[in-house]
């Protein structure tokens, strides 16, 4: 099984024990590590952070010790914006320039492949996204002719039904991608006005339409029905939780909220908590399991957080094995307890290790 793990370059800026550099990553934990994100400037793939080149080197040094590890560079992301991707992909010359710029950049910096994180192609971009993938793969095949190992090509795709329908020609893009990471999280957010888990495995009994689509099981099944081969589908598991501020004394699933939860001490983003911050939150909190959805949530005062723990990730891994998927994807290593100093077990990367162990279990 693949265990595809994202690392985010901005995690270096978190203060104190939240600061994570690639040299802190366990070289034997994942089969693939994806560095997020690269930029595109003047139609050429480019660095984003001032010290990306240093961090690329740090990440790719891990391969000296684990030659089986593959590293990919992810281009795009939320801050890059869909519009900029759209302009490049829809213009033949821009697209060609971008595609041509990728292999030398990856080779220079020691990466084994590219991950496309166009979040998200619009309805009019659907065909352009397919063309971009098809042409990128053709370039990778051509570039590898002189006996080089062919560069890998993957894409991170939304798990939301509406986005899947408007953005992706699943059957076509699957032919050209080495694997597809389906982002089976962020199904529920503060925009709903109520509490709910952002990464349930199954549909909950409390769920009403449109929530019958807002779960991992539906998204995976839908992707498979649309023609994604199970052998290429890698299922996303988050090492972060989504939090809410409760608006009343109700604390269950579907309770009214006044907005996102308060920012974490390290991640400093309202409505999001890293797993290591959740471990802190759990001290003195009340933990519940949403039985049908097979995921936990916790409450403390007026704060509510839905997250994954070692039990829920094992259920998710068993599910992906049952569906004969290619493996699991983790967003993100730097949101796990990477130092092993928060979650009371001392183990570094406890969630990702639980996923790895479950994948290896017979």
């Amino acid at each position: 099984y693949k265990l595809v793990c994202y690392y985010t370059s901005w995690s270096q800026y978190r203060e104190g024990d939240g600061s994570c550099f690639p040299d802190a990553l366990d070289r034997f934990l994942c089969t693939h590590i994806i560095y997020s994100f690269a930029n595109i400037s003047n139609d050429h793939i480019d660095t984003w952070e001032w010290n990306d080149v240093t961090l690329y080197g740090m990440l790719n040094t891990l391969k000296n010790r684990n030659p089986n590890l593959k590293t990919l560079l992810s281009v795009g992301g939320w801050n890059f914006g869909s519009q900029r991707f759209s302009k490049i992909a829809s213009n033949t010359q821009s697209r060609r320039t971008f595609i041509k710029s990728v292999p030398p950049f990856l080779r220079t910096h020691g990466f084994d492949g590219l991950d496309l994180a166009w979040l998200y192609p619009g309805r009019r971009d659907k065909q352009h996204f397919t063309t971009l993938i098809k042409e990128m793969k053709a370039e990778f095949i051509k570039e590898a002719q002189p006996g080089k190992k062919q560069l890998l090509l993957s894409a991170a795709l939304s798990a939301g039904k509406v986005t899947i329908d408007s953005s992706y020609d699943i059957a076509k893009i699957s032919q050209h991608l080495d694997f597809i990471s389906i982002m089976t999280y962020d199904f529920h957010g503060a925009w709903r006005g109520t509490t709910g888990h952002h990464s349930p495995l199954f549909r909950g009994q409390e769920d009403a339409s449109p929530d019958r689509f807002s779960n991992t099981d539906y998204a995976v099944g839908y992707m498979l029905r649309l023609g994604a081969p199970a052998s290429k589908l890698v299922m996303g598991i988050p090492t972060f939780g989504r939090s809410f501020t409760l608006a009343s004394s109700e604390t269950g699933v579907g309770a009214p909220i006044s907005g996102p939860g308060i920012p974490g001490r390290f991640t400093k983003e309202a409505g999001t908590l890293a797993y290591y911050e959740i471990c802190d939150f759990l001290r003195g909190a009340t933990v519940h399991r949403i039985l049908g959805q097979q995921v936990p949530y916790a409450t403390k005062g007026n704060q509510w957080v839905g997250y994954d723990d070692q039990e829920s990730v094992k259920s998710k891994v068993q599910y992906l094995k049952d569906r004969q998927l290619a493996g699991a994807m983790v967003w993100a290593l730097d949101l796990d307890d990477f130092q092993g100093s928060f979650c009371g077990q001392d183990l570094r990367f406890p969630l990702t290790n639980a996923i790895k162990d479950a994948l290896a279990a017979t």
């Epitope: 104190g16 040299d23 802190a24 891990l62």
Partner: antibody, heavy 118, light 106 residues
Framework: DVQLQESGPDLVKPSQSLSLTCTVT?????????WHWIRQFPGNKLEWMGY???????NYNPSLKSRISITRDTSKNQFFLQLNSVTTEDTATYSC???????????WGQGTLVTVSA | QIVLTQSPAIMSASPGEKVTMTCSAS?????MHWYQQKSGTSPKRWIY???KLASGVPARFSGSGSGTSYSLTISSMEAEDAATYYC?????????FGSGTKLEIK
């Protein structure tokens, strides 16, 4: 090749602070890796104390967290250990070290014996 | 924290003899590192990532193991191998060392 050299007092009184310097040659402490302090007690037991990362962030052994501070002077390519409120139990040979992978210690100084005694 | 128990604490071997020492972890670890220390000097990295020999380490040394059980083996003891050997992990925080196996030459 990188070399590390510890220096500091060899005798410290109980309740005082122990301060040691590690001078690094052959590699800039701001260029990469983590820079560690490890001590070896008279019975030969080894204990990792903490590190300062090239980025400046620190990580300490939880058993010492309330007493330890590791800092650096990048202009002199040195990093420092301060251990407060020492007792005779802190008598040990103190070594500075640099990692190779995140999790093991590839280069060590020769160590300096610090005795805590009245 | 993870406790590493090394056995035996002290052992002796004749030149040419095969030597095996073990390191048992109180919880599962991903891989183990080993150090050699001779009297009056700092430990030297000897074996890393369970089985890889550090630069300059003779091929008669080998390492193996997984989970909670690891070992260091010398296929044919030589006088220069007399030293104390420590195992070390950092799968869990903080990193910890074993109490050491002192290997003497007969």
């Amino acid at each position: 090749d990188v070399q590390l050299q510890e220096s500091g007092p060899d005798l410290v009184k109980p309740s005082q602070s122990l301060s040691l310097t590690c001078t690094v040659t052959g590699y800039s402490i701001t260029s990469g890796y983590s820079w560690h302090w490890i001590r070896q007690f008279p019975g030969n037991k080894l204990e990792w104390m903490g590190y300062i990362h090239y980025s400046g962030t620190t990580n300490y052994n939880p058993s010492l967290k309330s007493r330890i501070s590791i800092t650096r002077d990048t202009s002199k390519n040195q990093f420092f250990l301060q251990l407060n409120s020492v007792t005779t139990e802190d008598t040990a040979t103190y070594s500075c070290a640099r990692n190779y992978g995140y999790d093991e210690f590839a280069y060590w100084g020769q160590g300096t014996l610090v005795t805590v005694s009245a | 924290q993870i406790v590493l128990t090394q056995s035996p604490a002290i052992m002796s071997a004749s030149p040419g003899e095969k030597v095996t020492m073990t390191c048992s972890a109180s919880s599962s670890v991903s891989y183990m590192h080993w150090y050699q220390q001779k009297s009056g000097t700092s430990p030297k990295r000897w074996i890393y990532d369970t089985s890889k020999l550090a630069s300059g380490v003779p091929a008669r040394f080998s390492g193996s193991g997984s989970g909670t059980s690891y070992s260091l083996t010398i296929s044919s003891m030589e006088a220069e191998d007399a030293a104390t050997y420590y195992c070390q992990q950092w799968s869990s925080n903080p990193p910890t060392f074993g109490s050491g196996t002192k290997l003497e030459i007969k």
